[in-house]
Interface confidence: medium
Amino acid sequence: ILGGREAEAHARPYMASVQVNGEHLCGGVLVAEQWVLSAAHCLEDAADGKVQVLLGAHSLSQPEPSKRLYDVLRAVPHPDSRPDTIDHDLLLLQLSEKATLGPAVRPLPWQRVDRDVEPGTLCDVAGWGIVSHAGRRPDRLQHVLLPVLDRATCNRRTHHDGAITQRMMCAESNRRDSCKGDSGGPLVCGGVLEGVVTSGSRVCGNRKKPGIYTRVASYAAWIDSVLA
């Protein structure tokens, strides 16, 4: 997260760290007791490493009573996701067992009504992604509030040049932005999961390259079918 600040510890109990061989790779969001939603491209970077999900964490390194690392029973990328595009960039991870819920571990309600968030709405994005262009990684969860950007502006040639489909949404990126390592994390508007940070190699913090988020409401049928 660029231009953000440290989050209040455990105030986002849905927040997950998707890890490979014990290292944070991507963000994720607990959407059901045994399921974490993340970004499909995250798996590409996992190679043949052991994928696990950390729940109940604030610090990645320090012991915390609520922290627990779960093995992944099944990884289900969206069937239409492709390595060369950010379309359908969603991944569902089934935990080896149901998560132990509590004040620091709780699923987040996700948007099912397929309607664009009003431009200008302030939404919260959180993650353990880099906090500087030099690539510095934080140990503790960071977050930032970002205004939603309308699709026409986001699709301008000087911005994302028509790449933003109806199934994506954008948020402003003027110095405050999600960045590398935040992919798969939640964009939360009004206490509801609206978007998932896409995992392209987008420049961060440049106002002409807004953050791109996959709209979960557009994938309600797929999410329901996998969780069923």
Epitope: D150, N155, Q166
Partner: antibody, heavy 114, light 108 residues
Amino acid sequence: EVLLQQSGPELVKPGASVKIPCKASGYTFTDYDMDWVKQSHGKSLEWIGHINPNNGGTIYNQKFKGKATLTVDKSSSTAYMELRSLTSEDTAVYYCGTGDFAYWGHGTLVTVSA
Amino acid sequence: QIVLTQSPAIMSVSPGEKVTLTCSASSSVSSSYLYWYQKKPGSSPKLWIYSTSNLASGVPARFSGSGSGTSYSLTISSMEAEDAASYFCHQWSSYPPTFGAGTKLELK
């Protein structure tokens, strides 16, 4: 298929105004700005400005401020450009374009003549 | 504003000949925002090359684009009759977006 339908040629008197429609179909109207361009005979294309259909926000080329006014009607997926205080210098073909000119209308010829 | 100068204004080319059209900018243009359009009489312009070197959908592979900074070009490896048209360069690197005056390509 993306289509931008513009109206037929207009013959207008000096000092009058003209409003040119551009009806969009084949895509979600609010997903892209609508741009307008002028092509005078034997001259280069000139960008007039664009409008964001979501909120009606406009950006104009300084040269056309006060000459052109861009509006949209979301309910009919139609963009409009009004040209006022017309002179012979305004005689040209006017194009609308979207997706930052991946798609163009067929153009509307405006002739200003007494 | 950035002025785009295209040369030559008119070019007569025999079928099979290699053609290079140039576009010179009065100040540096980001290669991501340099585009070319093809225009035939009575038709609206068509996006032909985007981001300096990417061919738009349906554009034959004999076309290519290159350049950086203030100097850009469009090349046809082997001229065909259907390529006779006007070609405009266009920049969106800074406001206002501007167009070159075009090069008219004629078949000899």
